[in-house]
């Protein structure tokens, strides 16, 4: 069977402070079953940005309906960007379990924040 791929097509995205940023992510397969989470940064210090299953992420919205059957697009939009949002964002696939097990990460998309033009 073909290995699951987590595809983040853009290596980098640049937005002005105050604007919204779209971070794209698709998966190559619906199998295995399990959630996608977004993180800023890698390793133990990474910051959870979006988890559809639980939590409240008011500045983040899913671009496609993640609850829709056969959805393979897990892109997100972050609103009202500030300089503290700069960093590399990873789309990460988990296998459903107790707890969920991390399977594969995308290559990452670096978000840079420009000063808002005056």
């Amino acid at each position: 069977e073909e290995e699951l791929q987590v595809i983040q097509p853009e290596k980098s995205v640049s937005v002005a402070a105050g604007d919204s940023a779209t971070l794209n992510c698709t998966v190559s397969s619906l199998i295995p079953v399990g959630p996608i989470q977004w993180f800023r940064g890698a390793g133990p210090g990474r910051e959870l940005i979006y988890n559809l299953k639980e939590g409240h992420f008011p500045r983040v919205t899913a671009v496609s309906d993640p609850t829709k059957r056969n959805n393979m697009d897990f892109s997100i939009r972050i609103s009202n960007i500030t300089p503290a949002d700069a960093g590399t964002y990873y789309c990460v696939k988990f296998r459903k379990g107790s707890p969920d097990v991390e399977l594969k990460s995308g290559a990452g998309t670096e978000l840079s924040v420009r000063a808002k033009p005056s």
């Epitope: 133990p44 959870l48 503290a84």
Partner: antibody, heavy 119, light 108 residues
Framework: DVQLVESGGGVVRPGESLRLSCAAS????????MNWVRQAPGEGLEWVSR????????DYADSVKGRFTISRDNSKNTLYLQMNSLRAEDTAVYYC????????????WGLGALVTVSS | ETVLTQSPATLSVSPGERATLSCRAS??????LAWHQQKPGQAPRLLIY???NRATGIPDRFSGSGSGTDFTLTISSPQTEDSAVYYC??????????FGGGTKVEIK
Amino acid sequence: DVQLVESGGGVVRPGESLRLSCAASGFSFRSYAMNWVRQAPGEGLEWVSRINSGGGGTDYADSVKGRFTISRDNSKNTLYLQMNSLRAEDTAVYYCAKQYDWNSFFDYWGLGALVTVSS
Amino acid sequence: ETVLTQSPATLSVSPGERATLSCRASQTVGSKLAWHQQKPGQAPRLLIYDASNRATGIPDRFSGSGSGTDFTLTISSPQTEDSAVYYCQQYYYWPPYRFGGGTKVEIK
């Protein structure tokens, strides 16, 4: 309802240690960054430390760096602040505060725990 | 580091008389500014976030405005229970998170 309840405050001598705890309920604790903020008697609010949702990322105010350690146990819904080498100027009410999202303001505060450092 | 300066240090108003509190940032913080209220002997409570949005359960006599470096908290018709210290907090640049020095509001 979101509830944050601090404990572990007390009176210690300079150079001694103390560990504060903050028990959280009413929200998905493991999804949120948490902070400690302190307030010296008659003074304003001073941010002390922040820990990210997973517990692997921490930040500290310069005034406590190297002496204080923030940690969390997501299985127990509890936030901690280990305070070592305490000084008189650490005397304050210590509040735990929840962040609205990872890069945001503090939307809920605990009732506070009083720490007094005195010889 | 962004410094927040609040003025006046103390504001004394009569019930029903508009109260205007100022918070000035040393550099732009966009709209990333919150206001917290702290009554004597109590923990702080979030009033306003993103400069102008009222937090859940906050009466509409409280309003926030401003962006960039200059922000205002207005209490349109203060009640006696509004006697408190009010702090602004920026979350545009961090760490560290910064609070203003506070404005004490006294209702005569």
